[in-house]
C-alpha cells in the first residue's frame, strides 16, 4: 500500500498567533528570507524496497539533488557511518566502486544517484540493521546524508511488487514560475528590509505549532509561514522502522517503500548529531544544517526541476518530495 | 600527490610479532579505508583485510583472522598491521593499499627466519 | 569465498598484437571486478575497476568486459611496457585476487 502526502494549502496564519495585519507583513520577510536561503540548498534521498521476485533480496536508491559535483557516496546501514553504522558501498565517479557483504552490487545509475542491491539470505539479512543511510560529499556543498529503513519482515502472500510513483515532469512554465516568485520575492524582501531598517523589530510570539524546537520560534511564528518554508522532510513508507526514524503515516498500513528526501545532517557529524535529531511526527520538516525545525501538517509543493535524474521509468518515489530552485 | 608511505623490511623469528606501518599523505585518511594485501615471493595477491577509518571497523580474509590486527591512528593518518605467531609461511612482501586499491604504498618486505 | 581462476598462467605475445587475458568467478559477481598490472618489484598498479572502466591515466589500449563470472582484459595493440603481470580482483564479497596472468615476448 503507497501512502501519499497532500501539497499543503496556503492557509491565513491565525489572528491569535498573528495578532493585527502589521505583525502579518513581518512575517512575510522571514518567509522570504527562509525561501531565498534555501533554494539552493542541496537534498540527499533515499530509498529502499523488496524485490516482489526475491524476497529475500532489497534494493537502496540515493541520489543528490545539487548543483556541486559528487567526490565520494557512502552507503552504511545500523546509523551513519561514524556514528556506528557499518559500510555497505562506497562510490567514487573515478576511482570505482567498493563493497562489503551482505551488499551484492552496487552502481551509479546517473552521475548523481547510485544503486545497491543487498542479499537478504544468511545472518547478515537487512533487516538486522533496518536503516539505511546514503552519504554524499560534493563540492562546493560538502557532506549531505539522509537515511530510510526497510521492513522487519516480508509477507510471501503480497505477491504484486509495490507501484512506484510516476516520474515527475517538470515544465518549464513550473520551473520559471517558481524562480520569478523567489526572484521577485528576493527583491520584495531587499526592498522590504531597506524600508524597516531604521525600525526596532518587535519579539515574535512563539509559534504554538513546533513544541519540539524552541530555535525554530523566530523562524517559524504561524502554520502559514511554515508551510511555505521550503525545508526538507522526512517520510518512512514501512512497516519496519527503527527508533531513530520513527515517523507515522497518515493512512498507515504496510509498504515495502521508503523514501526520505531531506537535507540531512551537515558536517560535521557524528554520534551525538545523529542520536540528538528528533525526528518528528507526521509531515514534519527537519532540517538540521541551519538549526530549523518548522513543524507543519504536510509536504511542501513540488518546486523544482532537476527531474532528469532517473530515466528509469521506475523512477524513485522519492521524486516526489520538493526539490528547491537550483 | 597521495602517497602511502610503508615502513621498512623486517628480519624476525618464528613464533615473534612485527607491526608493520602505513602513512598516508595528500589525501584525507578518514575519508577512506585502508587494506592490507599480502605477496608472498612469485606469488598471487592475497587480501588480508581492511579498516575503516571512521570507527575503526575491520573486515578479514578468513584465513587471516587472528593471525593479523589492523589498527589506525587518525591523528598520524597512520595505519597498522601486526602479525602475530610468525612462521615462515608469513614470509612475504605486505602492502597496504587505499580503499579503491589505485594508490598502493612501496611494500614491507617480511622475512621469518631462526 | 568466491574464487578468482584465471587459466593462463603465461602468455606469449609481440609487439602490436591483441591480447586478451580472462579471469572466471566462482559465483556470479557482477561487474564488481577490477584489473591490476604489476611490473618485477613494483606495486600493483590499477587499471580497469567495474569490469569495465578505465582507471585514470590509464592507455585506451587496455580494455576490461564482461560481467557474472567471465571477465576479459584486452591490450589491443601491445607495447613492450605492457610486459608484466595482470591481475584481476572481486570485490562483490570481500575481495580476492586471480592467480595472475604473466605476460612475456615471444
Known amino acids: 500500500m503507497r501512502t501519499e502526502a497532500q501539497v499543503p494549502a496556503l492557509q491565513p496564519p491565525e489572528p491569535g498567533l498573528e495578532g493585527a495585519m502589521g505583525h502579518r507583513t513581518l512575517v512575510l520577510p522571514w518567509v522570504l528570507l527562509t525561501l531565498c536561503v534555501t533554494a539552493g540548498t542541496p537534498e540527499v534521498w533515499v530509498q529502499v524496497r523488496m524485490e516482489a521476485t526475491e524476497l529475500s533480496s532489497f534494493t537502496i536508491r540515493c541520489g543528490f539533488l545539487g548543483s556541486g559535483s559528487i567526490s565520494l557516496v557512502t552507503v552504511s546501514w545500523g546509523g551513519p557511518n561514524g556514528a556506528g553504522g557499518t559500510t555497505l558501498a562506497v562510490l567514487h565517479p573515478e576511482r570505482g566502486i567498493r563493497q562489503w557483504a551482505p551488499a551484492r552490487q552496487a552502481r551509479w545509475e546517473t552521475q548523481s544517484s547510485i544503486s545497491l542491491i543487498l542479499e537478504g539470505s544468511g545472518a547478515s539479512s537487512p533487516c538486522a540493521n533496518t536503516t539505511f543511510c546514503c552519504k554524499f560529499a560534493s563540492f562546493p556543498e560538502g557532506s549531505w546524508e539522509a537515511c530510510g529503513s526497510l521492513p522487519p519482515s516480508s509477507d510471501p502472500g503480497l505477491s504484486a511488487p509495490p507501484t512506484p510513483a510516476p516520474i515527475l515532469r517538470a515544465d518549464l512554465a513550473g520551473i520559471l514560475g517558481v524562480s520569478g516568485v523567489l526572484l521577485f520575492g528576493c527583491v520584495y524582501l531587499l526592498h522590504l528590509l531597506r524600508r524597516h531598517k531604521h525600525r526596532p523589530a518587535p519579539r515574535l510570539q512563539p509559534s504554538r505549532t513546533s513544541p519540539q524546537a524552541p530555535r525554530a520560534r523566530a523562524w517559524a511564528p504561524s502554520q502559514a509561514s511554515q508551510a511555505a518554508l521550503h525545508v526538507p522532510y522526512a517520510t518512512i513508507n514501512t512497516s519496519c522502522r527503527p527508533a531513530t526514524l520513527d515517523t507515522a503515516h497518515p493512512h498507515g498500513g504496510p509498504s515495502w517503500w521508503a523514501s526520505l528526501p531531506t537535507h540531512a545532517a551537515h558536517r560535521p557529524q557524528g554520534p551525538a548529531a545523529w542520536a540528538s535529531t528528533p525526528i518528528p511526527a507526521r509531515g514534519s520538516f527537519v532540517s538540521v544544517e541551519n538549526g530549523l525545525y518548522a513543524q507543519a501538517g504536510e509536504r511542501p509543493p513540488h518546486t523544482g526541476p532537476g527531474l532528469t535524474l532517473f530515466p528509469d521509468p521506475r523512477g524513485p518515489r522519492a521524486m516526489e518530495g520538493p526539490l528547491g530552485v537550483r | 600527490e597521495v602517497q602511502l608511505q610503508q615502513s621498512g623490511p623486517e628480519l624476525v623469528k618464528p613464533g615473534a610479532s612485527v607491526k608493520i606501518s602505513c602513512k598516508a599523505s595528500g589525501y584525507t585518511l578518514t575519508d577512506y579505508y585502508m587494506n592490507w594485501v599480502k605477496q608472498s615471493h612469485g606469488k598471487s595477491l592475497e587480501w588480508i583485510g581492511d579498516?575503516?577509518?571512521?570507527?575503526?571497523?575491520?573486515n578479514f580474509n578468513q584465513k587471516f583472522k587472528g593471525k593479523a590486527t589492523l589498527t589506525i591512528d587518525k591523528s598520524s593518518s597512520t595505519t597498522y598491521m601486526e602479525l602475530r605467531s610468525l612462521t615462515s609461511e608469513d614470509s612475504a612482501v605486505y602492502y597496504c593499499a587505499s580503499l579503491f586499491f589505485d594508490y598502493w604504498g612501496q611494500g614491507t618486505t617480511l622475512t621469518v627466519s631462526s | 569465498d568466491i574464487v578468482m581462476t584465471q587459466s593462463q598462467k603465461f602468455m606469449s605475445t609481440t609487439v602490436g598484437d591483441r591480447v586478451s587475458i580472462t579471469c572466471k568467478a566462482s559465483?556470479?559477481?557482477?561487474?564488481?571486478v577490477a584489473w591490476y598490472q604489476q611490473k618485477p618489484g613494483q606495486s600493483p598498479k590499477l587499471l580497469i575497476y567495474s569490469a569495465s572502466n578505465r582507471y585514470t591515466g590509464v592507455p585506451d589500449r587496455f580494455t576490461g568486459s564482461g560481467s557474472g563470472t567471465d571477465f576479459t582484459l584486452t591490450i589491443s595493440n601491445m607495447q613492450s611496457e605492457d610486459l608484466a603481470d595482470y591481475f584481476c580482483?572481486?570485490?562483490?564479497?570481500?575481495?580476492?585476487f586471480g592467480g595472475g596472468t604473466k605476460l612475456e615476448i615471444k
Open positions: 579498516i575503516n577509518p571512521n570507527n575503526g571497523g575491520t
Open positions: 559465483q556470479n559477481v557482477g561487474t564488481a
Open positions: 580482483q572481486q570485490y562483490s564479497s570481500y575481495r580476492t
